[in-house]
């Protein structure tokens, strides 16, 4: 799986990556004017893991398991 | 205050079994994924088991897949190492590690001061 | 498996100085490296995660860089507590490895 990941928040992400067999998805999360892009696990793909991965407490976030999916538009969706 | 306590630490004969407990408080145990990691008297660290925050995935190297099992309980904030068909490679200074660091898997931010494991005839 | 190789394997420096320590992935790990620091008779402490971030409460004097296979640790300044050991570790997926360790040693 390919996702879009970026070691800190950034606005734009570009960076692609070839995520390791045990990641099966791809995230992308807005919490205020933060924006986190990563290679995900599915199981995690819920409120109370990303909140507490991340340290957010409000935030909105897309999960999905198909190559570079993680991009910003799909929040705007 | 973030604290994790290993026990049931011991010598055991080669073949023999053992069953490693880590307590865990100060924290939200159940929304952390936890690995066990362990350091051989070479002073090498080697993870040996990880498990995801609902238990429902775990992942071991090769050299003790089949042989050790993480189990976790949520309810009692505590993790589980089971070994077995132990061997003289397996003595070292077991940890138990809180694992996902901010946004990342696989990184170790809060570590046991560890349980000492003796593999010996 | 992702084979993790540091060096050296000890090092012996002053108060003050500056030292670099490396790290080498077998292969492309992009920014996922961990640094830990492990002083006599203690659990490791995380240093560094991401290549370069540094973990809460570590002092700016450590600095992580690199990407892809190549990385380093650089400690400024060194002082007293510096001294122990240190550790680069993968985090790019399982099996996760450790590189064997560097000593870092008052002269």
């Known amino acids: 799986l390919q996702c879009y990941n970026c070691p800190n928040p950034t606005a734009d992400c570009k960076t692609a990556v070839n995520c390791s067999s045990d990641f099966d998805a791809c995230l992308i999360t807005k919490a205020g004017l933060q924006v986190y892009n990563k290679c995900w696990k599915f199981e995690h793909c819920n409120f109370n893991d990303v909140t507490t991965r991340l340290r957010e407490n409000e935030l909105t976030y897309y999960c999905c398991k198909k190559d570079l999916c993680n991009f910003n538009e799909q929040l705007e969706n | 205050e973030v604290q994790l306590v290993e026990s049931g630490g011991g010598l055991v004969k080669p073949g023999g079994s053992l069953k490693l407990s880590c307590a865990a408080s100060g924290f939200a145990f159940s929304s952390y994924d936890m690995s066990w990691v362990r350091q051989t008297p070479k002073k090498r660290l080697e993870w040996v088991a990880y498990?995801?925050?609902?238990?429902?995935?775990?992942h071991y190297p090769d050299t003790v897949k089949g042989r050790f099992t993480i189990s976790r309980d949520n309810a009692r904030n505590t993790l589980y190492l089971q070994m077995s068909s132990l061997k003289s490679d397996d003595t070292a200074m077991y940890y138990c590690?809180?694992?996902?660091?901010?946004?990342?898997?696989?990184?170790?931010?809060?570590w046991g001061q560890g349980t000492s494991v003796t593999v010996s005839s | 498996d992702i084979q993790m190789t540091q060096s050296p394997a000890s090092l012996s420096a002053s108060v003050g100085e500056t030292v670099t320590i490396t790290c080498r992935a077998s292969?492309?790990?992009?920014?996922?490296l961990a640094w830990y620091q492990q002083k006599q008779g203690k659990s490791p402490q995380l240093l560094v995660y991401n290549a370069k971030t540094l973990a809460e409460g570590v002092p700016s004097r450590f600095s992580g860089s690199g990407s892809g296979t190549q990385f380093s640790l650089k400690i400024n300044s060194l002082r007293p507590e510096d001294f122990g050991s240190y550790y680069c570790q993968h985090h790019y997926g399982s099996p996760l490895t450790f590189g064997a360790g560097t000593k870092l040693e008052l002269r």
């Open positions: 498990i995801s925050s609902g238990g429902g995935s775990t």
């Open positions: 590690a809180r694992d996902g660091y901010y946004a990342e898997y696989y990184v170790m931010d809060y």
């Open positions: 292969e492309n790990i992009y920014s996922y």
